[in-house]
């Protein structure tokens, strides 16, 4: 018989493939049909008979075209820290994600296997790069002439104020406070004005190392707790 | 990333032969088909056939068998389709595509390589 | 052999518009319909796959539905990159086959 209009279980031509949805089976050397997504092969192929599928049982699933003998089985429940963006299926696997302010500090094939908190960077430090799905916010100091007076995984350095007279002159972590009311350039939205104890930390005479990369959460590493990286706080 | 390269363009005389090759990366070369498609000048796509490089066992489009032959290289990632016994309506862009055999669609195609067959 | 035919060959449409092309098998193909682009000079590109599935990379715009013999490819806003041929296929049986192509020209 031709290739197209054979049926399953069929033995295919010597230096043929079987065709689409079908699998060769070593044992009955014959091509054999495969299970649809959401089922398995309860009883394989023979040389007379083709391959017998089954539903995947509840909290099982096959996500491809199979003929294993077992569905697979879905991945625990998503932690308090993620969402479930994908539930568990006969043909799908369970999805969880991070929830906001949180990253996945190790994926799997699919979804995160563990997430950890963004980075918060401290009063003058703002984000250099902010936190992305799979990578931790990474902080750098505020360079002369900005600052951030926030902990925080979203904020970046501002500028000081331009004030006509200076009250108190601006740092890393704190805006410039003017005398006049009125100063040349408005600061960005929600900014404080109130003056704040000036750091005893030389800000921008000495420059500040650029803060690790290395993820806020020491329990990742193989190693005993350490402190957090400079610029970032724990929590 | 995953892709499917070509070889050059050919001319051709009626009743010759060419082999066109398609070097695959990006991708474990052995675990997917390598299918080949015609598309004649102003004409739409014609499947000519796969073959799974894990064991070089093919499946034609019935209108090729004994037109086609396909083989693959396993050390180079490089599939093969020689054509024979040319005539001028065997002109056409000749394509390689990783298939899947399964939905059946092609889903990384090559650039293309034009045959032109002419006395 | 299965034998694609879209509804039209060529299509105009202006950037932003809502376009849908069509496609009908010679017969139940299921739901193993796939839609590619083709530009000149470069790769095609896979869509769309089993009926409605989109392929990675594909901007979300596209999409696809139908079942049986009719089957539709949507592209809800029409960018300017999207000026091209746009081909079915269906992979249901062998052989594969295509269907003729429309083409979706600029207005």
């Known amino acids: 018989l031709p290739a197209q209009v054979a049926f399953t279980p069929y033995a295919p031509e010597p230096g043929s493939t079987c065709r689409l949805r079908e699998y060769y089976d070593q044992t009955a050397q014959m091509c054999c049909s495969k299970c649809s997504p959401g089922q398995h092969a309860k009883v394989f192929c023979t040389k007379t008979s083709d391959t017998v599928c089954d539903s995947c049982e509840d909290s099982t699933y096959t996500q491809l075209w199979n003929w294993v003998p077992e569905c697979l089985s879905c991945g625990s429940r998503c932690s308090s820290d993620q969402v479930e963006t994908q539930a568990c299926t006969r043909e799908q696997n369970r999805i969880c994600t991070c929830r906001p302010g949180w990253y996945c500090a190790l994926s799997k094939q699919e979804g995160c296997r563990l997430c950890a908190p963004l980075r918060k960077c401290r009063p003058g430090f703002g984000v250099a790069r902010p936190g992305t799905e799979t990578s931790d916010v990474v902080c750098k100091p505020c360079a002369p002439g900005t600052f951030s007076n926030t902990t925080s995984s979203t904020d970046i350095c501002r500028p000081h104020q331009i004030c006509n007279v200076v009250a108190i002159p601006g740092n890393a972590s704190m805006d410039a406070v003017c005398t006049s009311t009125s100063p040349t350039r408005s600061m960005a939205p929600g900014a404080v004005h109130l003056p704040q104890p000036v750091s005893t930390r030389s800000q921008h005479t000495q420059p500040t190392p650029e803060p690790s990369t290395a993820p806020s959460t020491s329990f990742l590493l193989p190693m005993g707790p350490s402190p957090p990286a400079e610029g970032s706080t724990g929590d | 990333q995953v892709q499917l390269v070509q070889s050059g363009a050919e001319v051709k005389k009626p009743g010759a032969s060419v082999k066109l090759s398609c070097k695959a990366s990006?991708?474990?070369?052995?675990?997917?088909?390598i299918n080949w498609v015609r598309q004649a000048p102003g004409q739409g796509l014609e499947w000519i056939g796969w073959?799974?490089?894990?064991?070089?066992?093919?499946q034609f489009n019935e209108n090729f068998k004994g037109k086609a032959t396909m083989t693959v290289d396993e050390s180079t990632s490089t599939a093969y389709m020689e054509v024979r016994s040319l005539r001028s309506d065997d002109t056409a862009v000749y394509y390689c595509?990783?298939?899947?055999?399964?939905?059946?669609?092609?889903?990384?195609w090559g650039q293309g390589t034009t045959v032109t067959v002419s006395s | 052999d299965i034998q694609m035919t879209p509804s039209t060959s060529s299509l105009s449409a202006s950037v932003g518009d809502r376009v849908t092309i069509t496609c009908r098998a010679s017969?139940?193909?299921?739901?193993?319909l796939n839609w590619y682009q083709q530009k000149p000079g470069k790769a095609v590109k896979l869509l769309i796959y089993?009926?409605?599935k989109l392929h990675s990379g594909v901007p979300s715009r596209f999409s696809g539905s139908g079942s049986g013999t009719d089957f539709t490819l949507t592209i809800s806003s029409l960018q300017p990159e999207d000026f091209a041929t746009y081909y079915c296929?269906?992979?249901?049986?062998?052989?594969?086959?295509f269907g003729g192509g429309t083409k979706l020209e600029l207005k």
């Open positions: 017969q139940d193909i299921s739901n193993y």
């Open positions: 595509a990783r298939g899947d055999r399964d939905y059946g669609y092609f889903d990384v």
């Open positions: 073959i799974y490089p894990r064991d070089g066992n093919t």
């Open positions: 296929q269906q992979g249901n049986t062998l052989p594969l086959t």
């Open positions: 990006g991708y474990t070369f052995i675990t997917y088909d």
């Open positions: 089993f009926k409605s």
